[in-house]
């Protein structure tokens, strides 16, 4: 029997990417970061 169509079997967890900019004072510029799933990675 042929197989019925299904996906790969690996569940994909969709995570929200959040870009943020934080002002740390007029003379120090800003910190720009990328948060993935609650963890700052850049």
């Amino acid at each position: 029997d042929a197989e019925f169509r299904h996906d790969s079997g690996y569940e994909v967890h969709h995570q929200k990417l959040v870009f943020f900019a934080e002002d740390v004072g007029s003379n120090k510029g800003a910190i720009i970061g990328l948060m993935v799933g609650g963890v700052v990675i850049a």
Partner: antibody
Framework: QVTLKESGPGILKPSQTLSLTCSFS??????????VGWIRQPSGKGLEWLAH???????YYNPSLKSQLTISKDTSRNQVFLKITSVDTADTATYYC???????????????WGQGTSVTVSS | DVLMTQTPLSLPVSLGDQASISCRSS???????????LEWYLQKPGQSPKLLIY???TRFSGVPDRFSGSGSGTDFTLKISRVEAEDLGVYYC?????????FGAGTKLELK
């Protein structure tokens, strides 16, 4: 919410072509991973899977009936169609359509069914 | 074709009883992606079937936790821990791994 509703001729004669329509709402066949299938049930008997169509027009048929079956869709009108040629009295049954998704978010099972439409083949 | 054999075909119970329905496939229904597409549906009189369990043991949303599915390979079981009146009807197992997709003959859960 997701709903599906089947419609058909009610009664037809042997050797004629049965045309069924499944009209649905609450989801779209333009969404990747979405599909709709047909299942039938003779009165007082069990369930028989007939065919399935995916959003990308990939189609699957029951091999025992494949020469008689044609499944198609109208994505813009949210409808799926099934044609059965050269019907016989054995095709008398209630015909159901059901949604089946391909990806995890859509359960990958027949999660929503229509109420069914009764078809009688009689001379 | 994959033959799905359900036992028993009729299951008389009293309300509050535990009920167990067996389903055996004539060949393995493990898909090449590693998943087993074994599902359970309940059809009440005059209604369309409703999904209870998919992928052997996962309850569909809104299905009470008194329903549980188990098994692997070719042998599967649906258990109802405490039967309620609303559980009466015909239970079908179904395999969605191989074409043609096939149902068991059904098990009628009825009152003694």
């Amino acid at each position: 919410q997701v709903t599906l509703k089947e419609s058909g001729p009610g009664i037809l004669k042997p050797s004629q072509t049965l045309s069924l329509t499944c009209s649905f709402s609450g989801f779209s066949l333009s969404t990747a991973g979405m599909g709709v299938g047909w299942i039938r049930q003779p009165s007082g008997k069990g369930l028989e899977w007939l065919a399935h169509i995916w959003w990308d027009d990939d189609k699957y048929y029951n091999p025992s009936l494949k020469s008689q079956l044609t499944i198609s869709k109208d994505t813009s009108r949210n409808q799926v169609f099934l044609k059965i040629t050269s019907v016989d009295t054995a095709d008398t049954a209630t015909y159901y359509c059901a949604r089946r998704g391909l990806y995890y978010g859509n359960y990958d099972a027949m999660d929503y069914w229509g109420q069914g439409t009764s078809v009688t083949v009689s001379s | 074709d994959v033959l799905m054999t359900q036992t028993p075909l009729s299951l008389p119970v009293s309300l509050g009883d535990q009920a167990s329905i067996s389903c055996r496939s004539s060949q393995s229904i493990v898909h090449s992606n590693g998943n087993t597409y074994l599902e359970w549906y309940l059809q009440k009189p005059g209604q369309s079937p409703k999904l209870l369990i998919y992928k052997v043991s996962t309850r569909f949303s809104g299905v009470p936790d008194r329903f549980s599915g188990s098994g692997s390979g070719t042998d599967f079981t649906l258990k109802i821990s405490r039967v309620e009146a609303e559980d009466l009807g015909v239970y079908y197992c179904f395999q969605g791994s191989r074409v043609p997709l096939t149902f068991g003959a059904g098990t009628k859960l009825e009152l003694k």
